[in-house]
Interface confidence: low
């Protein structure tokens, strides 16, 4: 999906009002310095691409983020503010429903959500220009 035409300010508002708090809740009990940020993004469409990938694509050691509160709110924000996004996600969501068995919060998931926090923060504040 090409995130270029999303309403970035509306997505940012959704992040600030709820998604950020849900991410913090998920990470509660974890030190903010426990994980190093290894994933980054250069602009807002790129950030959303990385956010979508980390949130909804199962990875080795962490297959259970898609049903978390922050993930559902992320999906809702993208569906509302990114034209045509919903249609691209129907098949992927159905496949995920069949695969998902139980919710397990692993250290790998915590690390992945830590990466997500960094990506969201970068999305929320595009980089200063290098002078």
């Amino acid at each position: 999906y090409d995130f270029t035409n999303c309403d970035f300010e509306k997505i940012k508002a959704a992040y600030l009002s709820t998604i950020s708090k849900d991410l913090i809740t998920y990470m509660s009990g974890t030190k903010s310095t426990e994980f190093n940020n290894t994933v980054s993004c250069s602009n807002r469409p790129h950030c959303l691409t990385e956010i979508q990938s980390l949130t909804f694509n199962p990875t080795a050691g962490c297959a259970s983020l898609a049903k978390e509160m922050f993930a559902m709110k992320t999906k809702a924000a993208l569906a509302i503010w990114c034209p045509g996004y919903s249609e691209t996600q129907i098949n992927a969501t159905q496949a995920m429903k069949k695969r998902r068995k139980r919710k397990v919060t692993t250290n790998k998931c915590l690390e992945q959500v830590s990466q997500l926090q960094g990506l969201w923060r970068r999305f929320n504040r595009p980089l200063l220009k290098q002078q």
């Epitope: 950020s20 903010s32 190093n36 960094g118 504040r125």
Partner: antibody, heavy 121, light 105 residues
């Protein structure tokens, strides 16, 4: 716990340069911006500039442009502010202040203890 | 550059009284932050984005306003509240107001 620890007081002669350091701990250094703010005796707070530790991008107050240079050492989680061509009016307390952009409106939520720079001949 | 004007410059009140501090911007701003500074100390964030209490700040502090006019209110002054208060706006340049000193009457 977020902490910003600044270098010690400096006494400089007019025309010289000063470099103040700000060592960050308790958070991921590259996740937030670092501001530099100064306060001359009895005066208001004056914003000097801001740097992104993530990529070294900077934005400066036009008043200081050309005289102030902000840099970071990511490996040491340390930000630096260098002010050149010092004059007596630069005598002030210099603060680093983290700007957390999880705050709507981007507030400076943690400050260093301040570094006193005295410019005197 | 957006200029912030704070009034009054000095506010003389007694503990238990209500303090109302004003900050006026030379042009419209989205948000206003408020900081407290005590002698010999660094500023401390009190209110962010006009009306949100920063972490660890007691509920007697509140902020309001929009556009060019913003207010910091301390509902009942405690002895530790006597200090200088600065407003600050975020735009391409950050700027601070001149400060309001809240002193014991």
């Amino acid at each position: 716990e977020v902490q910003l620890v600044q270098s010690g007081a400096e006494v400089k002669k007019p025309g010289a340069s000063v470099k103040v350091s700000c060592k960050a701990s308790g958070y991921t250094f590259t996740d937030d911006y670092m501001n530099w703010v100064r306060q001359a005796p009895g005066q208001r707070l004056e914003w000097m500039g801001i740097i992104s530790p993530y990529n070294g991008g900077t934005s400066y107050n036009q008043k200081f442009k050309g005289r102030v240079t902000l840099t970071v050492d990511k490996s040491a989680s340390t930000a630096y502010m260098e002010l050149s061509s010092l004059r007596s009016e630069d005598t002030a307390v210099y603060y680093c202040a983290r700007e957390d952009y999880d705050y709507d409106g981007y507030a400076m939520d943690h400050w260093g203890q301040g570094t006193t720079v005295t410019v005197s001949s | 550059e957006i200029v912030l004007t704070q009034s009054p410059a000095t506010l003389s009140l007694s503990p238990g009284e209500r303090a109302t501090l004003s900050c006026r911007a030379s042009s419209s701003v989205s948000y206003m932050h408020w900081y407290q500074q005590k002698p010999g100390q660094a500023p401390r964030l009190l209110i962010y984005a006009t009306s949100n209490l920063a972490s660890g700040i007691p509920a007697r502090f509140s902020g309001s306003g929009s556009g060019t006019d913003f207010t910091l209110t301390i509902s009942r002054l405690e002895p530790e509240d006597f200090a200088v208060y600065y407003c600050q706006q975020w735009s391409s340049n950050r700027t601070f107001g001149g400060g309001t000193k809240v002193e014991i009457k």
